[in-house]
Amino acid sequence: LNTTILTPNGNEDTTADFFLTTMPTDSLSVSTLPLPEVQCFVFNVEYMNCTWNSSSEPQPTNLTLHYWYKNSDNDKVQKCSHYLFSEEITSGCQLQKKEIHLYQTFVVQLQDPREPRRQATQMLKLQNLVIPWAPENLTLHKLSESQLELNWNNRFLNHCLEHLVQYRTDWDHSWTEQSVDYRHKFSLPSVDGQKRYTFRVRSRFNPLCGSAQHWSEWSHPIHWGSNTSKENPFLFALEA
């Protein structure tokens, strides 16, 4: 079974401590080889994927993952119960909602079962690793002859998210962007009725409930304005 897990790169906001146990030996043994870094992302606080680069191992190795929460009621060591695979080799672990405790220090340990002393431990702040789902149900309302208001919904606690709105007209190549706080609405005060506008939004778990660096995917775009224009004779649906 080949499972492809798409996760953003980078883990800037994690606090990571690495502990590598090696055998005292003059020659380089397999236990001195560093284990790959584990990257965890919590998707909308519904599930968490902790993945590693399995191809960095010198030979195909089914590394095992254990986890626990530091200094908490959940400090019992747990085995991964749902591995993710890449070309039949373990490359990650998926944890379900009930196993996620955002505000306790998450400790994850990767181990080579053939060399039990070859292990690495990282400590992660999960509230900084949340990636919300893309905003949904974008709607546009005309507040006045030249003013538009964009609204959207998120499948998460609204006060925990900040947003980024981008918009452009048909002949713009670049986007104009505007940050929006937890209120999830955006007003464009001056709209040219002769132009067609495209809007899209993404969200981030920041700053009230966490300090995540990674944004959600972009929403489906929504359009406003004339269906055809003299310069750009292409038809659009109201919502892509």
Partner: antibody, heavy 120, light 107 residues
Framework: QVQLVESGGGVVQPGRSLRLSCAAS????????MHWVRQAPGKGLEWVAG????????YYADSVKDRFTISRDNSKNTLFLQMNSLRAEDTAMYYC?????????????WGPGTLVTVSS | DIQLTQSPSFLSASVGDRVTITCWAS??????LAWYQQKPGKAPTLLIY???TLQSGVPSRFSGSGSGTEFTLTISSLQPEDFASYYC?????????FGGGTKVEIK
């Protein structure tokens, strides 16, 4: 890693047609706008055409309008440039380029190019 | 259409020199400008976008500045691998346009 590979170039007579392809891999092709840029021998870069991520809008340089058509097949991760009524001045190296997902949308990845020579 | 004029077209310099290339836009484009480097026989690579934002992996000796109609690309200390052609591109509106290019040669 992102990879773009153009193909379909060659020698063609004036007035004839040619179809270029650009095979994309290493990224989610259906999420990104794509472009064709050309460079005549010993000359500078010239933007030719661009297409939005879903194909809903297409844009062209005046020099190729009504002769060239940009299209894409998101199921096959492939970008196309159909070139009709070719002229000697269309002789160039043709590059496909991917937009970066930032507000400014620069071209962050380019293919190695495919050479089109229009000559009788 | 927005025209971009690059100056100079050719530039001879030595390793270690500070090099400045200028790009003028025929109308205001705010900071919607990118710079690319191209080596002979190769595809261009992105150096700078948003007039001054360094693309990931690009050495810090490259910098960009400007807004509106005048923009500059500066190489603070020219290295052997920097001898190449450089192009500006406006990213504001269609049709997209490039400057005519600047070829940086060894003196």
């Amino acid at each position: 890693q992102v990879q773009l590979v153009e193909s379909g170039g060659g020698v063609v007579q004036p007035g004839r047609s040619l179809r270029l392809s650009c095979a994309a891999s290493g990224f989610n092709f259906r999420n990104f706008g794509m472009h064709w840029v050309r460079q005549a021998p010993g000359k500078g870069l010239e933007w030719v055409a661009g297409i939005l991520y879903d194909g809903s809008s297409k844009y062209y340089a005046d020099s190729v309008k009504d002769r060239f058509t940009i299209s894409r097949d998101n199921s096959k991760n492939t970008l196309f440039l159909q070139m009709n009524s070719l002229r000697a001045e269309d002789t160039a190296m043709y590059y496909c380029a991917k937009e970066e997902d930032t507000a400014m949308v620069p071209f962050d990845s380019w293919g190695p190019g495919t050479l089109v020579t229009v000559s009788s | 259409d927005i025209q971009l004029t690059q100056s100079p077209s050719f530039l001879s310099a030595s390793v270690g020199d500070r090099v400045t290339i200028t790009c003028w836009a025929s109308q205001g484009i705010s900071s919607y400008l990118a710079w690319y480097q191209q080596k002979p026989g190769k595809a261009p690579t992105l150096l700078i976008y948003a007039a001054s934002t360094l693309q990931s992996g690009v050495p810090s000796r490259f910098s960009g500045s400007g807004s509106g109609t005048e923009f500059t690309l500066t190489i603070s200390s020219l290295q052997p691998e920097d001898f190449a052609s450089y192009y500006c591109q406006q990213l504001k509106s269609y049709p997209l346009t490039f400057g005519g290019g600047t070829k940086v040669e060894i003196k």
